[in-house]
């Protein structure tokens, strides 16, 4: 069941899913100057069964200047360089997301896709937060949020994370400086904009995650 709204917004923090539950939608969005082909997929869908999940449908973008020219979905080498995967900064042994039942890994890029991805999450989805560059984390609990169903309505749990400027003194000593990450501001309703630049999760956050949804590569 689709979550009604976005994960909570934490000042100076951005969030990321490590794996996507079945039923998750990723809108087929194209970068400026390109558009989704007329009879192309509206979205990609995480789908599958208990043993295997994958993204259904392919997003295809065409130049908005020309008609009926379908661009291939295979990323070119230069694009792959721009969007290189990152290593999980975790002391624990990561598990390949593809092997996690009921979840999909980060979908591969498609040619001329938009710089931001708009996901629509489903009940049970977990997202993880980290402070943006120039801010450090003050943890009071897990830096994560889960979409839950209560009394027939969906809601996201509140992550216990405060991001403070580096110059401010921390009341939680021993916290390490977070890795740099882009500031991705969640949009309203169920749309969650996640920038496609590298997103590195720091060690301390990784330690709060369930090992079952670790991955060695993600955007």
């Amino acid at each position: 069941e689709l979550c009604d709204d976005d994960p909570p917004e934490i000042p100076h923090a951005t969030f990321k899913a490590m794996a996507y539950k079945e039923g998750t939608m990723l809108n087929c969005e194209c970068k400026r100057g390109f558009r989704r082909i007329k009879s192309g997929s509206l979205y990609m869908l995480c789908t599958g069964n208990s043993s295997h999940s994958s993204w259904d449908n392919q997003c295809q973008c065409t130049s908005s200047a020309t008609r009926n020219t379908t661009k291939q979905v295979t990323p070119q080498p230069e694009e792959q360089k721009e969007r290189k995967t990152t290593e999980m900064q975790s002391p624990m042994q990561p598990v390949d997301q593809a092997s996690l039942p009921g979840h999909c890994r980060e979908p591969p890029p498609w040619e001329n896709e938009a710089t931001e991805r708009i996901y629509h999450f489903v009940v049970g989805q977990m997202v993880y937060y980290q402070c943006v560059q120039g801010y450090r984390a003050l943890h009071r609990g897990p830096a994560e949020s889960v979409c839950k169903m209560t009394h027939g309505k969906t809601r996201w749990t509140q992550p216990q994370l405060i991001c403070t400027g580096e110059m401010e003194t921390s009341q939680f000593p021993g916290e390490e400086k977070p890795q740099a990450s882009p500031e991705g501001r969640p949009e309203s309703e169920t749309s969650c904009l996640v920038t496609t630049t590298d997103f590195q999760i720091q060690t301390e956050m990784a330690a709060t995650m369930e090992t079952s949804i670790f991955t060695t590569e993600y955007q």
Epitope: N27, R35, K38, S39, S41, L42, Y43, L45, E187, E189
Partner: antibody, heavy 114, light 107 residues
Framework: QIQLQQPGAELVRPGTSVKISCKAS????????LGWVKQRPGHGLEWIGD????????NYNEKFKGKATLTADTSSSTAYMQLSSLTSEDSAVYFC???????WGQGTSLTVSS | DIVITQSQKFMSTSVGDRVSVTCKAS??????VAWYQQKPGQSPKALIY???YRYSGVPDRLTGSGSGTDFTLTISNVQSEDLAEYFC?????????FGGGTKLEIK
């Protein structure tokens, strides 16, 4: 919460044009395709076309090309559908709808009558 | 254009019963099918996307299934609030097309 607000009714003369509005709120207007649907008793639901406000891109059902023109004003998060050379066949309820995830406006009842 | 056929225009059922509304596409549409519920004087409300996934707030008594050309919306333990018209829609090929609708009547 997503809302698509449309005027309840429009009464126009045959041969004229009408511009129906659809004001969006509760989501980022420029990031989603917004479609228009016609509903007439006995004719079911018909997809007229859709627009991507972020780039002004449009798709039209061939049947409605020349009849409907879709536009969007991003500054007011409002989509418009202009229907031209109106006849009694155009009398119907017109819905605007965010394409995906789907969410529909309440509809505008258009009556074409002299 | 892809033609969507809802062969049953009307269906009669009783509270507590189970009813299945069917929809047939003239060509393969994968699972790119949505189901809508429309009550008199209201706009259609989205129930199901991608043939089998429920929108938020849709009770789990409503279940979508099917792929390719044949699709079903099943309502188990029918309630009086289910009295409405049900439409399916394909969005696999443009223009997106709808079935003619099935009106559910409660005995």
């Amino acid at each position: 919460q997503i809302q698509l607000q449309q005027p309840g009714a429009e009464l126009v003369r045959p041969g004229t044009s009408v511009k129906i509005s659809c004001k969006a709120s509760g989501y980022t207007f420029t990031n989603y395709w917004l479609g228009w649907v016609k509903q007439r008793p006995g004719h079911g639901l018909e997809w007229i076309g859709d627009i991507y406000p972020g780039g002004g891109y449009t798709n039209y059902n061939e049947k409605f090309k020349g009849k409907a023109t879709l536009t969007a004003d991003t500054s007011s998060s409002t989509a418009y559908m202009q229907l031209s050379s109106l006849t009694s066949e155009d009398s119907a309820v017109y819905f605007c709808a965010r394409v995906t995830p789907a969410s529909w406006g309440q509809g505008t009842s258009l009556t074409v009558s002299s | 254009d892809i033609v969507i056929t809802q062969s049953q225009k009307f269906m009669s059922t009783s509270v507590g019963d189970r009813v299945s509304v069917t929809c047939k596409a003239s060509q393969n549409v994968g699972t790119n099918v949505a189901w809508y519920q429309q009550k008199p004087g209201q706009s259609p409300k989205a129930l199901i996307y991608s043939a089998s996934y429920r929108y938020s707030g849709v009770p789990d008594r409503l279940t979508g299934s099917g792929s390719g050309t044949d699709f079903t919306l099943t309502i188990s333990n029918v309630q009086s609030e289910d009295l409405a018209e049900y439409f399916c829609q394909q969005y696999n090929r443009y223009p997106y097309t709808f079935g003619g609708g099935t009106k559910l009547e409660i005995k």
